[in-house]
C-alpha cells in the first residue's frame, strides 16, 4: 500500500508525512572551505548525508509501520464494535450469511426442499437442521421469520418405531416444548412458521433452517467466511 493511500484511509494531513524531511533540504554551504578542510568536510558531508539518508529511511519505515498498525487497529475496533452487541465473552462469530441467535448461528434457506434433502444440505454445510431447546428459543427463532406464509423445516420428525417425535440428535420431544399442529404419524416432519409449529409431510418442499453451535474463536480477528 502506498503512503498516499495510507494517509487517505486514516484521514491524516498529507503534510505530516515522511516527505517533509528530504535530503534536498540540507543547507548548501555546509560543504564549502580550504582543500584539506574541503576533504574533511566532504568526508563529513558524505557521512552526514549517509546518516540523514539512514535516519530518513528509518523514519519512513517506522511511520509506515505505525500507520499500518493504526489501520489494522481501526479494522479490529470496527470489527469488535460490530460484534459487541451480539457476542458473548470469548469472541464468538458466525460465518457470513449466518445469523447469530444466542449461542447458535442460523442459516435460513432461500430455496425449497423435502425434509431429507434439507437434512443433507445442512450436513454439507457442517451443520444440522435446527434443534430447538425450549419455547423461548422457538419464539426468538420465529421472530426472525419475515412472513407468515413461510414454513421452515427443523430437525424433528416422527419416529414410527418409537411412535414419538424425535430430534435428529436422537432425543425425544418434550411435549411441553412445542405445541404441534397436525398429525403425529409416519412420514411426518416438523416445520415452523412465524406463529406456529406444524406437522407436514416430509416430502413437502419448503425452506429449512440449518444451525451451527458457536464456539470461542481464538487468535482470530475476522469472522469465518
Amino acid at each position: 500500500m502506498d503512503q498516499q493511500a495510507i494517509y487517505a484511509e486514516l484521514n491524516l494531513p498529507t503534510d505530516s508525512g515522511p516527505e517533509s524531511s528530504s535530503p534536498s533540504s540540507l543547507p548548501r554551504d555546509v560543504c564549502q572551505g580550504s582543500p584539506w578542510h574541503q576533504f574533511a568536510l566532504k568526508l563529513s558531508c558524505a557521512g552526514i548525508i549517509l546518516l540523514v539518508l539512514v535516519v530518513t529511511g528509518l523514519s519512513v519505515s517506522v511511520t509506515s509501520l505505525i500507520q499500518k498498525s493504526s489501520i489494522e487497529k481501526c479494522s479490529v475496533d470496527i470489527q469488535q464494535s460490530r460484534n459487541k452487541t451480539t457476542e458473548r465473552p470469548g469472541l464468538l462469530n458466525c460465518p457470513i450469511y449466518w445469523q447469530q441467535l444466542r449461542e447458535k448461528c442460523l442459516l435460513f434457506s432461500h430455496t425449497v426442499n423435502p425434509w431429507n434433502n434439507s437434512l443433507a444440505d445442512c450436513s454439507t454445510k457442517e451443520s444440522s437442521l435446527l434443534l430447538i431447546r425450549d419455547k423461548d428459543e422457538l419464539i426468538h427463532t420465529q421472530n426472525l421469520i419475515r412472513d407468515k406464509a413461510i414454513l421452515f423445516w427443523i430437525g424433528l420428525n416422527f419416529s414410527l418405531s418409537e411412535k414419538n417425535w424425535k430430534w435428529i440428535n436422537g432425543s425425544f420431544l418434550n411435549s411441553n416444548d412445542l405445541e404441534i399442529r397436525g398429525d403425529a404419524k409416519e412420514n411426518s416432519c416438523i416445520s415452523i412458521s412465524q406463529t406456529s409449529v406444524y406437522s407436514e409431510y416430509c416430502s413437502t418442499e419448503i425452506r429449512w433452517i440449518c444451525q451451527k453451535e458457536l464456539t470461542p474463536v481464538r487468535n482470530k480477528v475476522y469472522p469465518d467466511s
Partner: antibody, heavy 119, light 107 residues
Framework: EVQLVESGGGLVQPGGSLRLSCAAS????????MSWVRQAPGKGLEWVST????????YYADSVKGRFTISRDNSRNTLYLQMNSLRAEDTAVYYC????????????WGQGTLVTVSS | DIQMTQSPSSPSASVGDRVTITCRAS??????LNWYQQKPGKAPKLLIY???SLLSGVPSRFSGSGSGTDFTLTISSLQPEDFATYYC?????????FGQGTKVEIK
Amino acid sequence: EVQLVESGGGLVQPGGSLRLSCAASGSTFSSYAMSWVRQAPGKGLEWVSTISGSGGSTYYADSVKGRFTISRDNSRNTLYLQMNSLRAEDTAVYYCARGGLIPSGFDYWGQGTLVTVSS
Amino acid sequence: DIQMTQSPSSPSASVGDRVTITCRASQSISSYLNWYQQKPGKAPKLLIYAASSLLSGVPSRFSGSGSGTDFTLTISSLQPEDFATYYCQQTYSTPLTFGQGTKVEIK
C-alpha cells in the same frame, strides 16, 4: 401429468354461500401447498387463499378473510373453498393452483370455475 | 402490501420482434418474482420463476432478468402463439400480488 379440475361455481345471490372443489390427480397431493386465485371478468389475477400440504396452515387475502375458508381432504386429493357472505365483487373465475407457500409460484392451474354473485 | 406495476400495458408487435415487458415492485423483493402467460378463456401458465429460471418445457425464446425492484421478461423472437397477456407475480410476502397484466397484441 398433474391435473386440477374445479367444480361448484354458479350463480348465487349476495349474502349467499357456495362451496368450490378442486380434484387433483397426477402427483402426491399431500406434499404440496394448494391455492385459490381468482380473476374478475376482464380484470387481472388476484390471490385468494393458500393451504399447506397437511392443511395445518392457511392464509387469506384481506378481501376474503372471515368469509372464505380453505380446506383440503388429502385422502380424496381434493381442495375446497367455502365461500360465505358473498358480495358482487366476488364475481370471478376461480382457479385452483398448486403452490403458494413462499417462495413458490403456481406451477399448475385448473381450468377455472365461474362464480357469479348477483340478485 | 407490495404493489406490482407492469409496463407497457398493451404493446403491439409483429412476429419475429423482440418484446420486452417490465415489472416494478413497490419495494425490494429480491428475486422472488414469477412470470405467467394467459391466453383468452384459459388458465395462466407459469413461464419463469425466481426472476430468471425457465420452467421446464417453456421455449428458450423467453427469458427473465432483474432483482430487487426492477424485472424484465423478454421474448427474443415473437411467435404467433406468444400473443397473450403476461403477468408478473411476487412471492416475497403475503398477500401474494400480481401485476395488472401486459397484453401483447398483433401490430
